[in-house]
Amino acid sequence: ILLRAVTGFSGDGRAIWSKNPNFTPVNESQLFLYDTFPKNFFWGIGTGALQVEGSWKKDGKGPSIWDHFIHTHLKNVSSTNGSSDSYIFLEKDLSALDFIGVSFYQFSISWPRLFPDGIVTVANAKGLQYYSTLLDALVLRNIEPIVTLYHWDLPLALQEKYGGWKNDTIIDIFNDYATYCFQMFGDRVKYWITIHNPYLVAWHGYGTGMHAPGEKGNLAAVYTVGHNLIKAHSKVWHNYNTHFRPHQKGWLSITLGSHWIEPNRSENTMDIFKCQQSMVSVLGWFANPIHGDGDYPEGMRKKLFSVLPIFSEAEKHEMRGTADFFAFSFGPNNFKPLNTMAKMGQNVSLNLREALNWIKLEYNNPRILIAENGWFTDSRVKTEDTTAIYMMKNFLSQVLQAIRLDEIRVFGYTAWSLLDGFEWQDAYTIRRGLFYVDFNSKQKERKPKSSAHYYKQIIRENGFSL
């Protein structure tokens, strides 16, 4: 009660930073746990369309804001044609999935590959065929598809005509696109993600300018974009819930990403307050309206009163509970570069277990899908990616401890990524794939890295055996 009074936030997440053993959910003495994950744990791997598909203007695909951004903002990157060419080498991706033995494959649909100018009219036949073929192949292999509708590749036409996510007109257009996807693919897709990491879309797309569309310095635009992303997600959830769930019987969520942070002084109430503020300003910004009370976190409302849009009472009611599980992303994109505002002078940490505990306490112990997790290696590293294995072991150990020791309801894990590909502002200077791809080669062979062998073993053993 005292901490709540002092820190002024509605949830209970700040208990994570208390070093009182009776009060702290995480027992730091449990360094490694040799145990298995729950039976039927959902093991998967993911990719983002723009990162791996290539063929950015092939077969009638329209340009996305990222295709444009690459040509205007990123030096020494000609186009995503240099990527892993998943659009051409679908069979190779399927073989890679077979090799690892995953239960699910998380991929995103390129909106402009289906609708070149973003507006839902007649779909681009080749694009439709590609995703349909992929889904059929996954079903055949007993690999569950988890499909993301928006992983940052907004059709350029919508940016140019409406100003992209700054304009609330996009909400209905996105809903039309989602409706089409539900109609065409919903018979084969039981897990949908509306938007991948909206925080990065808003923060880097409109704040730092590091992501497409490359606008910067307008905090009001950042929060308007966030507002429209939340409302778009909510609209799509209600649409799915009302019109598609009854017969398709699937689940829908939004992937929210975050960093983790530790106080400089664990006994200092104000440092703990800053850590709470830090998490709230990144994860809570989107999680509170969707998984919480339907509104922005109180601290944000107070401190950003002149730039943060307001939800009406009706909208709060509409936003609240619009996710069937908590899809959580924890990876380098939320850490590098870290928004210094979010750091609040405290210490950034890669403690996924504590982040999961924070979610449990703040949002009433939801079912959690780790929708993106992993680290990166330098682009010069080929198949011997020992750092990636070390990081994966560390992260998976933390997830296992969260499940077994903290009773957190994690039901699935998405290793990121299946393939080396285009890594946003880092372009091709880093690699995140479990499969190595030589971007200069013609055939773009997928070569399993050490991490692929390691993950395959984890899946086979369903955890860590002694």
Partner: antibody, heavy 120, light 107 residues
Framework: QVQLVQSGAEVKKPGASVKVSCKAS????????IDWVRQATGQGLEWMGW????????GYAQKFQGRVTMTRNTSINTAYMELSSLRSEDTAIYYC?????????????WGQGTLVTVSS | DIQMTQSPSSLSASVGDRVTFTCQAS??????LNWYQQKPGKAPKLLIY???NLETGVPSRFSGSGSGTDFTFTISSLQPEDIATYFC?????????FGPGTKVDLK
């Protein structure tokens, strides 16, 4: 370094209007709010309202609603506060203050103040 | 509007003294409270935000505490340059409101 420089003192008759300017330098003008706070001689501080220079959005304290207008000219990094229908109790020093970027209710830099005297 | 009261309205102390005064809000304002220092003929200066966080460059002899409706401001060892009027400000609700101030001078 960050500076807010205000226009000089004004003497106005009751019923008239006054427009005070606040020129910002040393930072990106459009990234921070400008708030206006006044202080009658020997009295406390009274917050009048805010303006976001990026879009020009404003919010005024109820007490000043209908009498105050806050504007800006981004090409010269200057904010303005106009108060109309002046009365003697509006005699005060008027300060512009910068709201922090991520906590806009904390005023980290202030102008030197502009004395407005309302007298017949 | 939220009313802010401060007590005492003025106090006299010697250099090196520990000086404490209070600010009270007419309703719960959580931790949404800032403190400012104003020297004669000058503009106010932000010292503390969110009850107890020192603004960059502010000496550590200044501190703040409290939550809800009752807040305390402390100067651990009064220095001659601390002679000023100190105002609290709430931002729990618009309009933001300031306390009437506590004037600190030397004995």
């Amino acid at each position: 370094q960050v500076q807010l420089v205000q226009s000089g003192a004004e003497v106005k008759k009751p019923g008239a209007s006054v427009k005070v300017s606040c020129k910002a330098s040393g930072y990106t003008f459009t990234s921070y709010d400008i708030d206006w706070v006044r202080q009658a001689t020997g009295q406390g501080l009274e917050w009048m309202g805010w303006m976001n220079p990026n879009g020009g959005n404003t919010g005024y304290a109820q007490k000043f609603q209908g009498r105050v207008t806050m504007t800006r000219n981004t090409s010269i990094n200057t904010a303005y506060m106009e108060l109309s229908s002046l009365r003697s109790e509006d005699t005060a020093i008027y300060y512009c203050a910068r709201g922090k970027e991520f906590s806009r209710a904390e005023f980290d830099y202030w102008g030197q103040g502009t004395l407005v005297t309302v007298s017949s | 509007d939220i009313q802010m009261t401060q007590s005492p309205s003025s106090l006299s102390a010697s250099v090196g003294d520990r000086v404490t005064f209070t600010c009270q809000a007419s309703q719960d304002i959580n931790i949404y409270l800032n403190w400012y220092q104003q020297k004669p003929g000058k503009a106010p200066k932000l010292l503390i935000y969110d009850v107890s966080n020192l603004e960059t460059g502010v000496p550590s002899r200044f501190s703040g505490s409290g939550s809800g409706t009752d807040f305390t401001f402390t100067i651990s060892s009064l220095q001659p340059e601390d002679i000023a009027t100190y105002f609290c400000q709430q931002y729990d609700n618009l309009p933001f409101t300031f306390g009437p101030g506590t004037k600190v001078d030397l004995k």
